[in-house]
C-alpha cells in the first residue's frame, strides 16, 4: 500500500501508474467501492457523483499518455484521510492518504513569558512524530502535542514543524508573534538637574491596553505609583501622575517618559507594567543619579540608584591622576585645589557617567 501525506487546505496527488506507459481505462474509488472518477476509453474524465460532491477531485489529463493516472484531491480536509483504490489493467492499487495540520494554541500572538503549545491534527491510525524548530534554532520534538514554556522575544517569527510518518515528511510553517518590550531592562545614568528620558519600544503596535509605572526610590522601602496611562489606537493618554515630578509622557508610541529634572531623591528602580487583553508585560527601569557638590572645604561626589558592586566612583582634577577612587557610592576630597574637577562612575574600563564641577576657591559652598 502506498502512503501519501497531505496538508489540510492544500492539494495531494495520489499515484497510479500503468505498466504499459500509455493511456488506458482506470477508475479511482473509495474503499467502500463508491466511484470517484475515471477514464473509460474515450479520453474523457468521468466523475462518479454530482459536481458539488466531487469538485475537489481531479486527475492530470496530461499525464495519461505517459501511463500515469493520478488522483488529485484539492482543499484537503481531515476526513479525506482514508484508503483510495485505483483500478486499472485488472489490478487494484491501494493508496493511503493521511492529512495533517499543525495548529498553535488559541492564538499565534503571545506575550513574553507565556507558553506556546503546538498541536498536530492527525487522523486515526497515524502514528506521527513532530519536530519543530524555533526562529532562533531551538528544536523541540514530541508526539501530537508540543509545548514551549517561557517564550522570549527571539521566539517571534516562523516556526517550522516537520511531521514524520513512515519515513515520509510533511512540513508546516507557523508564524508566531511574541509580544514584548524590545529590551528587558533600561538604566539611565544622569547628573542631578539633567532631564532623563526613558523609551519603551514594543515589538508590536496594534494592541490596546493600560499601564503604570511603580517606583521605589533607593531611600524608600516601598513602591509607589508614579504614572498611569492608557493606550488606544496607538495614542497614549495619562490617567494619573505624581504632581511633584512633573513627568511627561509622549502622546504617541513608542512609550516615552521624561523626567524634566532628576535629583538624588528620585534615584531608584521601577517596574513598568503594560496590561493587554492577553496578559501583562513587565519592564524594569533604573535611574542612577550623580551629584557633585562643594561644601565648606570638602568636594563630595555621590551616586544613588541601582549600581553594581563592581562600579567605581573616581574624583579627579581634569587631566590629572585620580585623587580618590573607591567601589562605593560616596567619595570625598578635602581641601580640593581650584580648577575643574571630574567625578566618574565606571565599571571596568567603561565610563557610565561623569559630572564636572568648577572648584573656585577653598571654603566656597557650591552644588
Amino acid at each position: 500500500k502506498t502512503l501519501v501525506l497531505g496538508k489540510e487546505g492544500e492539494s495531494a496527488e495520489l499515484p497510479c501508474e500503468s505498466s504499459q506507459k500509455k493511456i488506458t481505462v482506470f477508475t479511482w474509488k473509495f474503499s467502500d467501492q463508491r466511484k470517484i472518477l475515471g477514464q473509460h476509453g474515450k479520453g474523457v474524465l468521468i466523475r462518479g457523483g454530482s459536481p458539488s460532491q466531487f469538485d475537489r477531485f481531479d486527475s492530470k489529463k496530461g499525464a495519461w499518455e505517459k501511463g500515469s493516472f493520478p488522483l488529485i484531491i484539492n482543499k484537503l480536509k481531515m476526513e479525506d484521510s482514508q484508503t483510495y483504490i485505483c483500478e486499472l489493467e485488472n489490478r487494484k492499487e491501494e493508496v493511503e492518504l493521511w492529512v495533517f495540520k499543525v495548529t498553535a494554541n488559541s492564538d499565534t500572538h503571545l506575550l513574553q513569558g507565556q507558553s506556546l503549545t503546538l498541536t498536530l491534527e492527525s487522523p486515526p491510525g497515524s502514528s506521527p512524530s513532530v519536530q519543530c524548530r524555533s526562529p532562533r534554532g531551538k528544536n523541540i520534538q514530541g508526539g501530537k502535542t508540543l509545548s514551549v514554556s517561557q517564550l522570549e522575544l527571539q521566539d517571534s517569527g516562523t516556526w517550522t514543524c516537520t511531521v514524520l510518518q513512515n519515513q515520509k515528511k510533511v512540513e508546516f510553517k507557523i508564524d508566531i508573534v511574541v509580544l514584548a518590550f524590545q529590551s528587558t531592562a533600561i538604566t539611565a545614568y544622569k547628573s542631578e538637574g539633567e532631564s532623563a528620558e526613558f523609551s519603551f519600544p514594543l515589538n508590536f503596535a496594534e494592541e490596546n491596553g493600560w499601564g503604570e509605572l511603580m517606583w521605589k526610590a533607593e531611600k524608600d522601602s516601598f513602591f509607589q505609583p508614579w504614572i498611569s496611562f492608557s493606550i488606544k489606537n496607538k495614542e497614549v493618554s495619562v490617567q494619573k501622575s505624581t504632581k511633584d515630578l512633573k513627568l511627561q509622557l509622549k502622546e504617541t508610541l513608542p512609550l516615552t517618559l521624561k523626567i524634566p529634572q532628576v535629583s538624588l531623591q528620585f534615584a531608584g528602580s521601577g517596574n513598568l507594567t503594560l496590561t493587554l487583553d492577553k496578559g501583562t508585560l513587565h519592564q524594569e527601569v533604573n535611574l542612577v543619579v550623580m551629584k557633585v557638590a562643594q561644601l565648606n572645604n570638602t568636594l563630595t561626589c555621590e551616586v544613588m540608584g541601582p549600581t553594581s558592586p563592581k562600579m567605581r566612583l573616581t574624583l579627579k582634577q581634569e587631566n590629572q591622576e585620580a585623587r580618590v577612587s573607591e567601589e562605593q557610592k560616596v567619595v570625598q576630597v578635602v581641601a580640593p585645589e581650584t580648577g575643574l574637577w571630574q567625578c566618574l562612575l565606571s565599571e571596568g574600563d567603561k565610563v557610565k557617567m561623569d559630572s564636572r564641577i568648577q572648584v573656585l576657591s577653598r571654603g566656597v559652598n557650591q552644588t
Epitope: M78, T103, N105, P124, S127, S129, G143, K144, T145
Partner: antibody, heavy 125, light 107 residues
Framework: QVQLVESGGGLVKPGGSLRLSCSAS????????MNWIRQAPGKGLEWVSY????????FYTDSVKGRFTISRDNAKNSLYLQMNSLRAEDTAVYYC??????????????????WGKGTTVTVSS | EIVMTQSPAALSVSPGERATLSCRAS??????FAWYQQKPGQAPRLLIY???TRATSIPARFSGSGSGTEFTLTISSLQSEDFAVYYC?????????FGQGTKLEIK
Amino acid sequence: QVQLVESGGGLVKPGGSLRLSCSASGFTFSDYYMNWIRQAPGKGLEWVSYISSSGITIFYTDSVKGRFTISRDNAKNSLYLQMNSLRAEDTAVYYCAREDYSNYEDHYYYYTGVWGKGTTVTVSS
Amino acid sequence: EIVMTQSPAALSVSPGERATLSCRASQSVSNKFAWYQQKPGQAPRLLIYNASTRATSIPARFSGSGSGTEFTLTISSLQSEDFAVYYCQHYNNWPYTFGQGTKLEIK
C-alpha cells in the same frame, strides 16, 4: 492519579437526546486526543468517535454520523458526546478513553491506555 | 472497514496452563494492534499495544505476537484473575474495530 469519570447516561425514548460528559483529572487534558467507545449489553465493543487535543479533528463511526457530536472543553477538563435522534441500537455502556503514546528510538506508538468506568444509556419506549 | 475475527469464541483452560488466543484482520493492519481484557461490570483494560508491547503494569505472563493480519495473545501460566473476556482491536485506520471477543473460562 489519572482518572476519567463518565456521567449523563440514563433512560431515554427513541428519537430523544442525551448529553454524556467525561471529567478528566490527574493529567494535562489539553495534551491528549480522546475517544468515545460503546458496548451494547452482552455484546462486543464499538468505537464511536475520536477527537484531537484541540478539538479540530473529529471522526465518527458511520452508524452515528449526523446524530452524535463529540466536543471538548479543555478549560474544564471535560469531554462530551451529544447524542440526538437516539435509536434502540444505541443502547450501550459508553466509555470515554484517552489516547496515549510511547516513544522508542524517535518512533511514536499510539494506543488507548486509560478508560473510564462507563455510563449506561438505555433507549427504550 | 477492517473486520477482526477472534478464535476461538470460548476457551476452557486449567489454572497454571498456557492459553493461546488468535485474531485475524480482514486486511493488513501492520502492527497497529492491541489486546484488551474485560471482566464483568468493568471497563476493558489494555494488555498489549503495538502488537507485542506490554502495557504498564501488565504481568510478563502476557505476551503478544504477529503482524499484518495474524495475531496471537499468549498467557503462559494462567492465574485465577486471568479468566475474563479478551478483545483484539486494530488502530490502523478509521474506523477502529474490535474482534467479537474470546471468553476464557476455568476448566
